[in-house]
Each structure stands twice: as structure tokens, then as C-alpha cells.
């Protein structure tokens, strides 16, 4: 029957007896940056050109015998993957491989990038369709090859690498850290982490999401038809880029920002078990796995967001942290969050002509995280109101005053070390959902957006009682833009978007006592684009 | 995902004189920095990616190499340009003694140096 | 869905050459290889060929190469196994199969049974 | 070339007896191998593909297992309307080539 990765990213209406889901990825071509291959496996024979680029360093050891299957194996297998006649996740995607790793499946950062030089070669000589870029390798934490993965990708390239299977942030690694690079986790049958060994999948705030990478049957290079199951990120990252090209088939327009929000979009959400994750890096963990979206038609009506987390600021005073967007998204939140509950709030600033989201540690805390919701918004015109601190009982409060701009997120900062649970909260009067509220003591920043046909509109849960965690979606059809919470007190840890839902987190309930000022709520600016589902529409 | 001043491992050496008379002297101020892996078994000492800042022609990232190759002679070391980098990123790849990377790290145009190191597939 | 189409039966004379016919359809002709496969009666499977209808190329059991011809013609979907010089040791059930790469033989056809007879 | 070999040409087994069938290759022939079941008067069907995997629509009472040279077909709960031939196959180099078949007869 239907392999079960193949099955687990198929949307059901086309789960058959033959997976074949229309347009098969047909104009992409996938680049794979691996071991050599065995092109005239039957499951890939036709569908893989072997380029002439070699750069590999020695095998190690002297006794070391260079068998032609082995040396193939993992790159025969992902060539598999992608696009495999039976166990492909693309069957109508053509495919490049370049030889970057060894008989022993390593190869160095200068071979690497040398392979992503060539490829930038290729395309400026012979322009084709979209280009994808499989890296199924990783090393550790490399300027140069982010940098240079970061030059393909603005060149119009879409990157997919593995995560690592180092159980471990992927941010110590590379190319995984790159935030250009579409970086996968892998996930087994029971959509669980992958272990492998003593070690497993890495995670973190680098991977973007999850895809199935154990018992992947795939070719196996002993002979032409061959297959074997292998398990690892790399066959995680190989069934995205397979993803990737149907994707890019049926939309050969979509940037990178567009395709990494619709793998996002269309990712079956919190089916992984995080305590398989170390606590602190649960939260940071997208918890996604990927799967081809239920038709080959666009979802450009869409107003697709993702959440940004920014590395970890540090413990010291002064400390902050930046999460920013990627070049094609808009900015349309800022929130912070702090473990130890000890942070100055966040603010949206301009950076290089772009905004970006900064939060501040405080004396005392051990760090904290900025948070930024990215959106896709075409045509948007955003900017950031600020309202000083009010010092007025009612609390700070700014609105967005321009004609036709709709308030998107809400931001905090404060430069007090201690706001003080002992202020009354503040509540928002009704009927004003166009502006923000805070403490007093803080300013307070609204990110006011005019795009056309864009609206939106605030939703609120409290909880009068105190809870470690409070939570507001946004209903169907409708996109989380902003989260954050009410009143702005310092047993707040912080507020962050999960997918559709605004998740405020308080500290422990048994410190904080069960008094009024335990009263937590979150607040979600939920939007959608009435100018994007139009413009659909005439399309279809 | 991770920015650049990110979790890894940085060696910054100033440059603090105009030794070897360099024509194109570099800016007043910058500094080049060093990177390397910081998983010590990963490292691959003796290879180098000198990378230029963003704007060098290939002309100039050749003139720079043969530059480090013509003074690195003078003080008795060899060096090898394996690679003259364009297309996505302007610098060379260099195989040298680590003794030369101050000298190096003063060459205009250089925006950092990273020590070769090992990938492995996942 | 997927069909390989054979005659029930030839009679042929000593001497003579048959051309067996297996039309496909319900699936990309040219994405598989086809193969043939004799089987004499009460006795087992026996691999003759294999041939891939997007290029013509072909892999013969040594035992079958002066006497099985395999050709298909893509605009009819249709592979053919020429069968030259015949004997009684030719009279058998004759089946195509389509190979998948990692399915194997997962359709045959219902064959044809060739007899050889003066 | 590549000899599969099927010990046992009959195997006589009651309803809801577990059976299996061994089949040797003469080389390494990793999973590459296929089993096939020919009722009679029949085209062969399809049942085991890469030695272990078992075919869509087939009942989960079939199983396959090895590798290397020695592998196993199996049948955990026999029916009546298993009576047929089973060949192995293997696929790992031309010419292909099939065990002489064992034939499962119901008492």
C-alpha cells in the first residue's frame, strides 16, 4: 500500500491506490547538493541529470574501500524522495545533483558553497522555472554559508535543508540557521520527534516546520530497483522540496515568502508531542508538519501570517532581542516574552528602512525573546503610532488616526524595572477596537496598516482567576495579526502567537496568589483582506 | 532565523597598522573578523574563506588574493587560491598557514575570514 | 484503472513466428517497464524480457534472445512480443506485467496461450 | 544468474494453520525480492513487494520477511481461498528470476 510518509502529506481527496496528485511538480527543478547518485535507478532513470560538479574532500582513513553503492546510498535515496516514480513526492519533477559530500557522506562548507555558486551559474545562463535547492547536509554555524544561502535565496531560489540530527538547536548549525533557508525537523508515523540513536531531530526556533523523516522508504543504490527504508532530516527536508515543486507547479509565481507561508498554512498543527523537546525550547518549536495544500488552485485570497522568534537576548540589563520579518512580509505585531517574567516590554522600530520587533530584558531577568508577526500583505502601507506614558490612572492609550488604517498589533515597552501588580487593571472601554491600551507607566505602540480591502477586528478572553496560560483565536476565514495581553503587569511572562491563536502566559499560579490582580487578558487582533478573496474570485 | 551575531564562535583582530604599505588601504575603522566552527572536531584548519565586502568586482577579489599570495611569500609562507568566488559572493578560498590570517584580515575589501569546515549529510 | 489487454490464444505452426500483443491503459504507458513472462503448463514462472516503452530499451534472459523479439509502439500503447522459430517447447501461457520500481509486478495481463501445432 | 530456491514444491496446511515459505537466493540480493500468488487458471497477483511490504488491498494475514539471501512468506491464519501457487522473485539484477513455486493444498 501508499507508503505511510506518502500518505501522512496527502490531503485526502487524493489518497488512491496510485498517490498522483495532479501536476507533479513538472516545471520545477529541484537541485539536490548530496553524494553521487545512481541515475539509472529505475524508481529516479529520466528524471535526474548528474551535473559535472564534484568537490569533495578525501575519505578518511586508509583502509578505506570506495564502493559505488554505498557511495551513492543517501543521495540515490533523496533523489528518490523528491521525485521517485513510486515513493516520490513530486513524479513529475525533474532533478540536478551535484557531489558535495563523500563516500562517507561529508563534504565541507567551501565545497558547499562553491555547489550553490554553480547553481547561481546555471541559472544566470539558462534561465528556467522555479529553482529548488535541497541541502541535506549540515555543519556547525557558518556566516559564510548562510550568507551565501541568503544571496540565492533574494536571487529568486528557494532553499530546503535538514535540520540536523544532532538533538539540538538548529541554530548551532548550518545551513539550518539560515533565515532564508527553509529548515525541516523530521517526524515518525505517529507524527512524534525523530529519534535516531542517542540522538534525533534538532529543533528549535530555526526549524520552520516538520515533515516525515523515519522508515522513509526509498531507491536504494544496491541495484537498479532497489528500495530501503533511511530515516534522518535530510529525508524530511527532501519530502518539503518535493512539496516545494508541486507548489511551485501550480504557482510558478510564488516568492519565498509566499511558499514558506502556504507550507506553514497547510501543515497539519499540533500533532507533535513537545515533551520529546527540552522545555526550553518547546515553545520556540514550530509545532508543524508538512503537507501538499488540498488543491493545485492558489489560496491567494488568503491573509497568511507566521510567527518570528528572535534568538535569546541574554541575561544582562540593557540586553534585547530583534526578530524581524523576511524582505516580501509585513511587520504587523511586536510581542515579548520572558521565562523569568522580568522583561521591559517590546517596541517596532525601523531598521534599515524595514520595521523590525525589539524586546527588552530587565534588571534581574534572565533574558528575553522578541516575537513578531509576519504577514503577507500586498500593497500595505504600515507604520507605528507611540503614546508616552500616560502617568494618568486611565492608563496609556494611542489609536490609529489616519484615514483608512486599521490598528494590526499592540506593543509595550516600559523603561521602570517593576510596573507593579498593584495598579488596578485596565480595561478597554467598549467600542473602541481601533486603539491600544496600557499601564500607565509604559508607552505604548499601535502598528496601523492600510492595505486594500484589509479589516479587522479585536477579540478578548479574560480570566479573572489566575491561569498559567490564556488563549483567544481567531475564528475561521479570519488571521491572527496581533497578540497581547491586558493589563500589561509584570506577572505577565509575555504573549506570542501560536498558528491561529493568542496564547498569554502568566508565571505560576502558586506565586502569584489567587487576588484580583491574578486577572489576565489576552487580546487578539484578528484580520482578514476582502481585496485578496475578490481578486480570487475574478480568478476563478 | 539567526542573525548574524549569532551562536558561534568569532576571533576579532583589529587592524592596528598600514604595514606592507598597502595601496588600498582599508577603511578608517573597520574590522575585519574571524569566524570558525565552534565544534572543534569539525574544524578544517589551513583552508579559508576570505570574504570581500559586497560590492568587490571579480577583478579586485583576484587582485586581493594575489595580494595575500604576493605577501604572504615575503614572510617564507606558501599559500594556494583554490577558488576566486563571484556570482553569489565576492573573496577566494585560500589554503594557508593559520599564522597568516592577521595579514590577511588587513587586505582591502575584506569583510571576514571563516575557517573551512566539514558538513555531513543528515 | 489499470488493464493489460492480451488475446486468449494462437495456434501456430512449427517454424512460424507469432507476435504477441498487451495494450495498456488506465496509466502512463511510458512511465513503466513491461515484461513478459512464460509459463509452460504445470510448470512455473519463467522471465523472458523486459522492455521500456519510453525508449525501446531492452534486457533479455540469455535462454530467450534468438527467440523473443520485444518492441512496443507508444501511439497505441501497446507492447509486442515477437516470438520467432517456434516448437512445442514454445506452447505456454505467455503474460505482460507491468514493473513499477517499487511495486514490482503489480499488474499482469490475463495471457495468451500460444500452441504450436502442425 | 540469480537461483531462487523454493524448498518445499507442496505445503499441506488445515484452515487457520500458520504457514510460511522459505525461499533461498543463490547470491545477496539485499530486499529486492517480490512474492506472487497464482490461483488456478489465473494471472499471478502481486502480494509482497521489497521483501516486507505488503501490497495494496492484500489481507494483513500475508507477510513477508529477510534479507540477504534467506527470506520468508507467510500466512498467519490460512483460508480456503489461499489454495494457489506462491513464487518469490527476486528483482536485483537481470535476468529476473522466480522460485520454482511452492503449492498450498488445504486438507
Known amino acids: 500500500s501508499i507508503p505511510w510518509n506518502l500518505e501522512r502529506i496527502t490531503p485526502p481527496r487524493y489518497r488512491a491506490d496510485e498517490y498522483q496528485p495532479p501536476d507533479g511538480g513538472s516545471l520545477v527543478e529541484v537541485y539536490l547538493l548530496d553524494t553521487s547518485i545512481q541515475s539509472d535507478h529505475r524508481e529516479i532513470e529520466g528524471r535526474v541529470m548528474v551535473t559535472d560538479f564534484e568537490n569533495v574532500p578525501e575519505e578518511d582513513g586508509t583502509r578505506f574501500h570506495r564502493q559505488a553503492s554505498k557511495c551513492d546510498s543517501h543521495g540515490t535515496h533523496l533523489a528518490g524522495v523528491v521525485s521517485g516514480r513510486d515513493a516520490g513526492v513530486a513524479k513529475g519533477a525533474s532533478m540536478r545533483s551535484l557531489r558535495v559530500l563523500n563516500c562517507q557522506g561529508k563534504g565541507t562548507v567551501s565545497g558547499t558553497l562553491i555547489g550553490l555558486e554553480f547553481i547561481r551559474k546555471s541559472q544566470l545562463v539558462q534561465p528556467v522555472g522555479p529553482l529548488v535547492v535541497l541541502l541535506p547536509l549540515a555543519g556547525g554555524y557558518s556566516r559564510v554559508l548562510n550568507a551565501a544561502c541568503q544571496r540565492l535565496a533574494r536571487a529568486g531560489v528557494v532553499l530546503v535543508t535538514a535540520a540536523g540530527n544532532f538533538r539540538d538547536d538548529a541554530c548551532l548549525y548550518s545551513p539550518a540557521s539560515a533565515p532564508e533557508v527553509i529548515t525541516v525537523g523530521a517526524t515518525n508515523a505517529q507524527d512524534q520527534p525523530v529519534t535516531l540513536g542517542t540522538l534525533g531531530t534538532n529543533f528549535g526556533r530555526c526549524v520552520d516546520l516538520f515533515a516525515p523523516g523515519e522508515d522513509i522508504i526509498g531507491a536504494s543504490s544496491d541495484c537498479s530497483t532497489c528500495f530501503v527504508s533511511q530515516s534522518g532530516t535530510s529525508q524530511a527536508a527532501a519530502h518539503v522540496a518535493g512539496i516545494a515543486a508541486m507548489m511551485l507547479s501550480a504557482e510558478p509565481e510564488l516568492t519565498l515568502a509566499e511558499l514558506r507561508q502556504r507550507l506553514i498554512h497547510f501543515s497539519a498543527k499540533d500533532v507533535i508531542n513537545e515533551a520529546w523537546f527540552p522545555e526550553d525550547q518547546r515553545v520556540l518549536t514550530p509545532n508543524l508538519v508538512a503537507a501538499l495544500p488540498p488543491s493545485t488552485h492558489g489560496a491567494g485570497w488568503q491573509l497568511f501570517c507566521r510567527t518570528v522568534w528572535s534568538a535569546h537576548s541574554g541575561p544582562t540589563r540593557m540586553a534585547t532581542a530583534v526578530a524581524r520579518c523576511a524582505p516580501d512580509e509585513e511587520l504587523l505585531s511586536c510581542s515579548s516574552f520572558s521565562r523569568s517574567g522580568k522583561r521591559r516590554g517590546e517596541r517596532m522600530e525601523a531598521q534599515g528602512g524595514k520595521l523590525v520587533c525589539r524586546a527588552h530584558n530587565a534588571f534581574g531577568g534572565e533574558g528575553v525573546y522578541a516575537i513578531a508577526r509576519c504577514c503577507l500583505l500586498p500593497q500595505a502601507n504600515c507604520s507605528v503610532h507611540t503614546a508616552p506614558p500616560a502617568e494618568a490612572s486611565m492608563g496609556t492609550r494611542v489609536h490609529c488616526h489616519q484615514q483608512g488604517h486599521v490598528l494590526t498589533g499592540c506593543s509595550s515597552h516600559w523603561e521602570v524595572e517593576d510596573l507593579g501588580t498593584h495598579k488596578p487593571p485596565v480595561l478597554r472601554p467598549r467600542g473602541q477596537p481601533n486603539q491600544c491600551v496600557g499601564h500607565r507607566e509604559a508607552s505604548i505602540h499601535a502598528s496601523c496598516c492600510h492595505a486594500p480591502g484589509l479589516e479587522c477586528k479585536v477579540k478578548e478572553h479574560g480570566i479573572p482567576a489566575p491561569q498559567e496560560q490564556v488563549t483567544v483565536a481567531c475564528e475561521e476565514g479570519w488571521t491572527l495579526t496581533g497578540c497581547s495581553a491586558l493589563p500589561g503587569t509584570s506577572h505577565v511572562l509575555g504573549a506570542y502567537a501560536v498558528d491561529n491563536t493568542c496564547v498569554v502566559r502568566s508565571r505560576d499560579v502558586s506565586t502569584t496568589g489567587s487576588t484580583s490582580e491574578g486577572a489576565v487578558t489576552a487580546v487578539a487582533i484578528c484580520c482578514r483582506s476582502r481585496h485578496l478573496a475578490q481578486a480570487s474570485q475574478e480568478l476563478q | 532565523q539567526e542573525d548574524e551575531d549569532g551562536d558561534y564562535e568569532e576571533l576579532v583582530l583589529a587592524l592596528r597598522s598600514e604595514e606592507d604599505g598597502l595601496a588600498e588601504a582599508p577603511e578608517h575603522g573597520t574590522t575585519a573578523t574571524f569566524h570558525r566552527c565552534a565544534k572543534d572536531p569539525w574544524r578544517l584548519p589551513g583552508t579559508y574563506v576570505v570574504v570581500l565586502k559586497e560590492e568587490t568586482h571579480l577583478s579586485q577579489s583576484e587582485r586581493t588574493a594575489r595580494r595575500l599570495q604576493a605577501q604572504a611569500a615575503r614572510r617564507g609562507y606558501l599559500t594556494k587560491i583554490l577558488h576566486v568566488f563571484h556570482g553569489l559572493l565576492p573573496g577566494f578560498l585560500v589554503k594557508m598557514s593559520g599564522d597568516l590570517l592577521e595579514l590577511a584580515l588587513k587586505l582591502p575589501h575584506v569583510d571576514y575570514i571563516e575557517e573551512d569546515s566539514s558538513v555531513f549529510a543528515q | 484503472q489499470v488493464q493489460l489487454q492480451q488475446p486468449g490464444a494462437e495456434l501456430v505452426k512449427p517454424g512460424a513466428s507469432v507476435k504477441l500483443s498487451c495494450k495498456a491503459s488506465?496509466?502512463?504507458?511510458?512511465?513503466?517497464?513491461m515484461h513478459w513472462v512464460k509459463q509452460r503448463p504445470g510448470q512455473g514462472l519463467e522471465w523472458i524480457g523486459e522492455?521500456?516503452?519510453?525508449?525501446?530499451?531492452?534486457n533479455y534472459n540469455e535462454k530467450f534472445k534468438s527467440k523473443a523479439t520485444l518492441t512496443v509502439d507508444k501511439s497505441s500503447s501497446t507492447a509486442y512480443m515477437q516470438l520467432s522459430s517456434l516448437t512445442s517447447e514454445d506452447s505456454a501461457v505467455y503474460y505482460c506485467?507491468?514493473?513499477?520500481?517499487?511495486?514490482?509486478?503489480?499488474?499482469w495481463g490475463q495471457g495468451t496461450s500460444v500452441t504450436v501445432s502442425s | 544468474d540469480i537461483v531462487m530456491t523454493q524448498s518445499h514444491k507442496f505445503m499441506s496446511t488445515s484452515v487457520g494453520d500458520r504457514v510460511s515459505i522459505t525461499c533461498k537466493a543463490s547470491?545477496?540480493?539485499?530486499?529486492?525480492v517480490a512474492w506472487y500468488q497464482q490461483k488456478p487458471g489465473q494471472s499471478p497477483k502481486l502480494l509482497i513487494y521489497?521483501?516486507?511490504y505488503r501490497y495494496t488491498g492484500v489481507p494483513d494475514r500475508f507477510t513477508g520477511s529477510g534479507s540477504g539471501t534467506d527470506f520468508t512468506f507467510t500466512i498467519s491464519s490460512v483460508q480456503a481461498e489461499d489454495l494457489a501457487v506462491y513464487y518469490c522473485?527476486?528483482?536485483?539484477?537481470?535476468?529476473?528470476?522466480f522460485g520454482g513455486g511452492t503449492k498450498l493444498e488445504i486438507k
Open positions: 506485467a507491468r514493473e513499477r520500481p517499487l511495486y514490482a509486478m503489480d499488474y
Open positions: 488506465g496509466y502512463t504507458f511510458t512511465s513503466y517497464w
Open positions: 522492455i521500456n516503452p519510453s525508449n525501446g530499451r531492452t
Open positions: 547470491q545477496d540480493v539485499s530486499t529486492a
Open positions: 521489497s521483501a516486507s
Open positions: 522473485q527476486q528483482r536485483y539484477s537481470t535476468p529476473r528470476t
